[in-house]
Every structure is written in structure tokens, then in C-alpha cells.
């Protein structure tokens, strides 16, 4: 090798001025006594390179580039060789922006994957490889205190998002979690979050269910629709509240919320709907009075209405 | 400190009726759901019945299903198993225990002795 | 319904030892597994519940793992105050079930 090139940081601010020496040693005997050394950066050559003899005998040239605004660019070094460029040693350069601190870091505990999920908003593009990694502790108290330590959580590459399984947590108990981002130019924190999990519990919805007709029940007004539902079995014991959705499935209404109904209802006669027409219904529900993620929508039923009874109407003849 | 105190067992002939009460305090009775598990002489515990926190939902375990009924009055902390037709098989100790959001016993009365003999 | 097969059906350690007790269910139950500790004479008494988590006071010698079909309820070193006969429970539907207990005996 007859070049090398060193730079102030391979890594900068964008925008940033950055700093390379190259330097040709002596012993390049079929090189000019006094070669030119010139600069590249990508395809452009860069003016501006002071040159100098060294006492061992070495060449040095000394550039400044006076902002960095390329993410990612080659540097080289190189000398004239007859007609052509030769290029004696490159740097890669790259140029971003030090992390910003990860926000609106939110956790729900997903009873079925018996984990806790957790997701944030990165911030802007920082150009530079930028690892997350989702942190926590349990804690007695209010997350002051900090208990045992969690393993670190690694998101997937270009993932926001995290799974604490359960062997690392710790229900009815608090966890202080944060996210903190690191790249080459600096390191950031997310505000830290104290929860409990099961305080950010998300149950699955409750199917529902036409409601089986009894011999001895009334049959639906004519406007109403009963249904029942079936609750997700291993969310059964945690107290409720659930509400129902509802529009016509033909033309462009929206939909048209009921309740709150608590879980226990099982069944429910919605009433003040079109008679004889179809409708979409849908069901979720949160843990309640205790802190909780809404469920899911369930998926729909479709349901009509009956029809009027018929009324009888006199007809005056007027001569 | 969770309490919870059963009462009502005794000796009973087959066929018989017999009515066991919870007494809870400590907690607020009202916001969890309940359960009877019973254990049989030198046996295993046997899950009986659970009801909802407001009364709505009472599941029973298929050997007591159309004899037993689980009932609560949240007003009086109390928690009821209505026990009619009465078998040998029936003979257990009966405990009263509170449920955890996870289906899990999380306090268990100390229990009261079912006899069913003739 | 779902069937609760515990084992062994007893055992004898001695203190000191390390004791693991398997429970299987019939089919998968997430982790809504629960464990119990009942004493002669004695209503039994929550040790773990949702598989892993340690109920309030529990000694930390008391540990479980496991999910889906296959638990286990490990005890890293029994004290004289351990034996005692262990139940697991399924919580995730009703019928609820137990598994059928393991006795734990002095050596």
C-alpha cells in the first residue's frame, strides 16, 4: 500500500466539517519525487488539499471539507498515473444525526401470548445504523426503586416494537420500561413508563351470537334484535364493560355505538333500529373499573330486523 | 386482612338438603368473582362452582349440575351453596375460596365438613 | 373438558434437595396454570399462579415454568416446612379442573 488515508471521525454531524490527512510513503520508488496528490469524494474531485514533505520523506496532503452533507460517500486519495486516476487508499464517511429521544411508548399484556408488547415512535430518520432496545426492572413501589433487572428486549432490525415474554414479568407488580436508542453519535432515552401489567391487559372480544329462540320468550319487536354473547373464556373472571356497534348494512351510515353493557348481560335486546332491514353488529370490551386496553372489534354478525305488523288502515271514498 | 369464614355443614341423610354460607370480609367482596372446591376423605380437591362477581354467571361442575346452586348476596359479603339431593359421593370438605382475574384461588376459607350417611 | 395428569403421584426427598413436579394438560392452556400447597388438616394455599408468578410471601425457592400443555413446579431446595401434598389447577375454561396432587415425603 503507498497511501493511507485518516480521518478526524469516519462518523459526523451532517452538515458537519471533517478533517482526512493521506499520506504516501517514501519507499513508493516509481512514483514522482514530488507527486500531486488529489481528493475524491464520490465522484467529485475536492480542491483545496495542502500538500507538504514530511522529514521522513513522506508526502502528506490535508483536506477540509467544509460540510459534510452526504449520509454515506467515499473518500480517496489518489495520484495522476499517465492518463488515468490512481486511487491510493478510500474512507468510507458517513454523516446523520445522533438519535432523538424514542416517544409515545406504550405496553399492552396480551393474556394469549401470555407477553408484553411493547411499541414506540422512533423519531426522524437519523441516516446512521440506530439500535433500540427496550428496557425495564421490576419494582415493589412506584419505580423509584429499582428491583431486579430485565433482560433487554432487541427489536427485529426496522422494528418498533418488543415482546417481554412472560418468565420475565411479574403480574400485579410494576416495571419501570423505557426505550433507549444508540447510534455512533450519541445515545437517547425514552421517558420511562411504570406500569403494572395487567393494568394494560387487552382481552380478546366476546363472539357474537343470534340468540336462540325459547318457546316461551316473545318473539323481537318489530325495530329490535336480540343477541347473546359468548365471553373469551380465559378473560372470564376479570370484571368488564363491553359496548356494541351497529349499522344497516346497505348505504353509507356510520356506526352507531351502545352502552356501556357489562360483560354479564350475556344477552341484549337492541332496539330503535329500521324494521326489516340487515344490519352489522360487532362487540368489544375493557377490563373495568380497573385499568385496561380495549379488545378488538369482534368479528360481525349480521342480523335483520323483523318486519312491522301489519296495520290496518280505513279507506274514506270521498264522491 | 382477606377472611373468609364458611358455615352450614353438618350431617345429612341421602336425598337430604343442606344450605352452606361464606361470611367475606377484607376485601371488597362485590368486584371478584367466588368459588366452592371441595375434598373428598383422603381424596383430591374437586372444583364445585364459581359465580360472577354480580351473580350472572354460575358454571358447575358436571357431578353437581341440577343439584347444587351457587348464589351471593353482595350487600351481606356473602356467599351461598344451596346443596339439594344429597349423595354419599357428596361427602367432603367444603371450602370457600376468591378468585384472582385469572381464574386462580387466591384465598381459601378453612373449610366445613359435608357428611352424607344414613 | 379439559384433563389436568399430575406426577409423580407422590415422592420422598430429603431436605436440601432440588424436587420438580410435572403437570400436563389434555390440550393447550396459555399459561393459566395455577399451583397449590395444602397441609394436613389445612385449606390449600396459592403458591404460583399464571404459571410463573410467585404469590405474595411465597418463598423464592418456589418457582414455575412452562406453557401450552406441559408445567413444572420446581423446589430448589426443600426446607422441612415444604412437605406437603402440591395441586396444580387449569384457569383458562371451566370446568375447572386439578390435577390430582403430589405428595411430597420425607426421606
Known amino acids: 500500500e503507498c497511501g493511507h488515508i485518516s480521518v478526524s471521525a469516519p462518523i459526523v454531524h451532517l452538515g458537519d466539517p471533517i478533517t482526512a490527512s493521506c499520506i504516501i510513503k517514501q519507499n513508493c520508488s516509481h512514483l514522482d519525487p514530488e507527486p500531486q496528490i488529489l481528493w475524491r469524494l464520490g465522484a467529485e474531485l475536492q480542491p483545496g488539499g495542502r500538500q507538504q514533505r514530511l522529514s521522513d520523506g513522506t508526502q502528506e496532503s490535508i483536506i477540509t471539507l467544509p460540510h459534510l452533507n452526504h449520509t454515506q460517500a467515499f473518500l480517496s486519495c489518489a495520484l495522476n498515473w499517465g492518463n488515468s486516476l490512481q486511487i491510493l487508499d478510500q474512507v468510507e464517511l458517513r454523516a446523520g444525526y445522533p438519535p432523538a429521544i424514542p416517544h409515545n411508548l406504550s405496553c399492552l399484556m396480551n393474556l394469549t401470548t401470555s407477553s408484553l408488547i411493547c411499541q414506540w415512535e422512533p423519531g426522524p430518520e437519523t441516516h446512521l445504523p440506530t439500535s433500540f432496545t427496550l428496557k425495564s426492572f421490576k419494582s415493589r413501589g412506584n419505580c423509584q426503586t429499582q428491583g431486579d433487572s430485565i433482560l433487554d428486549c432487541v427489536p427485529k432490525d426496522g422494528q418498533s416494537h418488543c415482546s417481554i415474554p412472560r418468565k420475565h414479568l411479574l403480574l400485579y407488580q410494576n416495571m419501570g420500561i423505557w426505550v433507549q436508542a444508540e447510534n455512533a453519535l450519541g445515545t437517547s432515552m425514552s421517558p420511562q413508563l411504570c406500569l403494572d401489567p395487567m393494568d394494560v391487559v387487552k382481552l380478546e372480544p366476546p363472539m357474537l351470537r343470534t340468540m336462540d329462540p325459547s318457546p316461551e320468550a316473545a318473539p323481537p319487536q318489530a325495530g329490535c334484535l336480540q343477541l347473546s354473547w359468548e365471553p373469551w373464556q380465559p378473560g372470564l373472571h376479570i370484571n368488564q364493560k363491553c359496548e356494541l356497534r351497529h349499522k344497516p348494512q346497505r348505504g353509507e351510515a356510520s356506526w352507531a355505538l351502545v352502552g356501556p353493557l357489562p360483560l354479564e348481560a350475556l344477552q341484549y335486546e337492541l332496539c330503535g333500529l329500521l324494521p326489516a332491514t340487515a344490519y352489522t353488529l360487532q362487540i368489544r370490551c375493557i377490563r373495568w373499573p380497573l385499568p385496561g386496553h380495549w379488545s378488538d372489534w369482534s368479528p360481525s354478525l349480521e342480523l335483520r330486523t323483523t318486519e312491522r305488523a301489519p296495520t290496518h288502515h280505513h279507506h274514506h271514498h270521498h264522491h | 386482612e382477606v377472611q373468609l369464614l364458611e358455615s352450614g355443614g353438618g350431617l345429612v341423610q341421602p336425598g337430604g338438603s343442606l344450605r352452606l354460607s361464606c361470611a367475606a370480609s377484607?376485601?371488597?367482596?362485590?368486584?371478584?368473582?367466588m368459588g366452592w372446591v371441595r375434598q373428598a376423605p383422603g381424596k383430591g380437591l374437586e372444583w364445585v362452582s364459581s359465580?360472577?362477581?354480580?351473580?350472572?354467571?354460575?358454571p358447575y361442575a358436571d357431578s353437581v349440575k341440577g343439584r347444587f346452586t351457587i348464589s351471593r348476596d353482595n350487600s351481606k359479603n356473602t356467599l351461598y351453596l344451596q346443596m339439594n339431593s344429597l349423595r354419599a359421593e357428596d361427602t367432603a370438605v367444603y371450602y370457600c375460596?376468591?378468585?384472582?382475574?385469572?381464574?386462580?384461588?387466591?384465598?381459601w376459607g378453612q373449610g366445613t365438613l359435608v357428611t352424607v350417611s344414613s | 373438558d379439559i384433563q389436568m395428569t399430575q406426577s409423580p403421584s407422590s415422592l420422598s426427598a430429603s431436605v436440601g434437595d432440588r424436587v420438580t413436579i410435572t403437570c400436563r394438560a389434555s390440550q393447550g392452556i396459555s399459561s393459566y396454570l395455577n399451583w397449590y400447597q395444602q397441609k394436613p388438616g389445612k385449606a390449600p394455599k396459592l403458591l404460583i399462579y399464571?404459571?410463573?408468578n410467585l404469590q405474595n410471601g411465597v418463598p423464592s425457592r418456589f418457582s414455575g415454568s412452562g406453557s401450552g400443555t406441559d408445567f413444572t413446579l420446581t423446589i430448589s431446595s426443600l426446607q422441612p416446612e415444604d412437605f406437603a401434598t402440591y395441586y396444580c389447577q387449569q384457569s383458562y375454561a371451566y370446568p375447572q379442573q386439578f390435577g390430582g396432587g403430589t405428595k411430597v415425603e420425607i426421606k
Open positions: 359465580i360472577s362477581s354480580s351473580g350472572g354467571v354460575t
Open positions: 377484607g376485601f371488597t367482596f362485590s368486584l371478584y368473582w
Open positions: 375460596a376468591k378468585l384472582g382475574e385469572l381464574g386462580f384461588f387466591q384465598e
Open positions: 399464571y404459571a410463573s
